[in-house]
Interface confidence: medium
């Protein structure tokens, strides 16, 4: 799986979309998990409704919401009030039995609020980022990870 980068502005909302084949994944619940280290497990953040037919209902866990358009084949995750610690590698997953298929690997980048003059030195940029021109709520820029670009910062 290629990694898609989604960029959001600190303090605002970021929407991540994960398209999938609605026929292939028919009847399956979905989940959003955070990758713990490059080879570590993916820790569940939030999953769609326990009853698959109600997957369109938005479910929240803290500041993260998930909703699934099962007919159109799009899983949408909303990260509200984006913070620097939200930056990192995530996965959209399709659940079947005790297993999970990766629908998309997502790298979330948190950009400094251009209207906030506080020091942005603690904001993490895993690689060369595209400029963020539109700071509208629920808006994001996404791109595929560049070849050779590392989704995790080097560990000392």
């Amino acid at each position: 799986h290629n990694t898609t980068v989604f960029q959001g502005v600190a303090g605002q909302s970021l929407q991540v979309s994960c398209p999938y084949d609605s026929m292939k994944h028919w009847g399956r619940r979905k989940a959003w998990c955070r990758q713990l280290g490059e080879k570590g497990p993916c820790q569940r953040v939030v999953s769609t409704h326990n009853l698959w037919l109600l997957s369109f209902l938005r479910r929240w866990n803290g500041s993260t919401a998930i909703t699934d358009d099962t007919l159109g084949g799009t899983l949408t995750i909303t990260l509200r009030n984006l913070q620097p610690h939200d930056a990192g590698l995530y996965q959209c997953q399709s659940l079947h039995g005790s297993e999970a298929d990766t629908l998309r690997k997502v790298l979330v980048e948190v950009l400094a609020d251009p209207l906030d003059h506080r020091d942005a030195g603690d904001l993490w940029f895993p690689g060369e980022s595209e400029s963020f021109e539109d700071a509208h709520v629920e808006h994001s820029i996404s791109r595929s990870l560049l070849e050779g670009e590392i989704p995790f910062p080097p560990t000392s």
Partner: antibody, heavy 123, light 112 residues
Framework: QVQLVQSGAEVKKPGSSVKVSCKAS????????MNWVRQAPGQGLEWMGR????????NYAQKFQGRVTITADESTSTAYMELSSLRSEDTAVYYC????????????????WGQGTLVTVSS | DVVMTQTPLSLSVTPGQPASISCRSS???????????LHWYLQKPGQSPQLLIY???NRFSGVPDRFSGSGSGTDFTLKISRVEAEDVGVYYC?????????FGQGTKLEIK
């Protein structure tokens, strides 16, 4: 109507490979999982693996991992099962079977089966 | 892998009488979407298997209403209310909740 037509019987030598085909018609081939199940003489049913023709995604039973390859050709709506390093215990009838979908939810049951292909492994 | 165990392995029934086959799984067959993917197949002599019941209790199209399925979790039952001559063959329970899909050993139904 849905039809799955399999290739004819094969006689193979131990150590060789066999490739069985399954031509599908009457439904959207690309968007339904296709399974392969085998049945040794006088024995029960054994699931080998499956493929989703739309993107080539496959799952195999551990027992056959490394020896079986399931492929699909969307242009001809045909699924293939190739089994290598054949041994006498692989003598069996091999079936392709489509996974049924019903709403709401996936039933994930095999509703249509091919007629079966007898593969005999003998020296 | 999920192990499916059927009982009895063979059954001899007088036409018109009921028959019952039990199937037990080694772990729960409730999927993450809350459906239970337990199915029943019949393989008549010299034929390919055919689907009878899907998702525990749903009769497949064309299957007579004398066939019924029930159960939950790990214990399931197939019942034939009145056995007919055409019902002879081997009955298999199968799960598709978890990959790899697995089948029971089969129950052979004969007519007395």
């Amino acid at each position: 109507q849905v039809q799955l037509v399999q290739s004819g019987a094969e006689v193979k030598k131990p150590g060789s490979s066999v490739k069985v085909s399954c031509k599908a018609s009457g439904y959207a081939f690309s968007s339904s999982w296709m399974n392969w199940v085998r049945q040794a003489p006088g024995q029960g049913l054994e699931w080998m693996g499956r493929i989703y023709p739309g993107d080539g995604d496959t799952n195999y039973a551990q027992k056959f991992q490394g020896r079986v390859t399931i492929t699909a050709d969307e242009s001809t709506s045909t699924a293939y099962m190739e089994l290598s390093s054949l041994r006498s215990e692989d003598t069996a009838v091999y079936y392709c079977a489509r996974l049924l979908r019903n709403q709401p939810g996936e039933s994930y049951a095999m509703d249509y089966w091919g007629q079966g292909t007898l593969v005999t492994v003998s020296s | 892998d999920v192990v499916m165990t059927q009982t009895p392995l063979s059954l001899s029934v007088t036409p018109g009488q009921p028959a019952s086959i039990s199937c037990r799984s080694s772990q729960s067959l409730v999927h993450s979407n809350w459906y239970t993917y337990l199915h029943w197949y019949l393989q008549k002599p010299g034929q390919s298997p055919q689907l009878l019941i899907y998702k525990v209790s749903n009769r497949f199209s064309g299957v007579p209403d004398r066939f019924s399925g029930s159960g939950s979790g790990t214990d399931f039952t197939l019942k034939i209310s009145r056995v007919e001559a055409e019902d002879v063959g081997v009955y298999y329970c199968s799960q598709s909740t978890r990959v790899p899909y697995t089948f029971g050993q089969g129950t052979k139904l004969e007519i007395k």
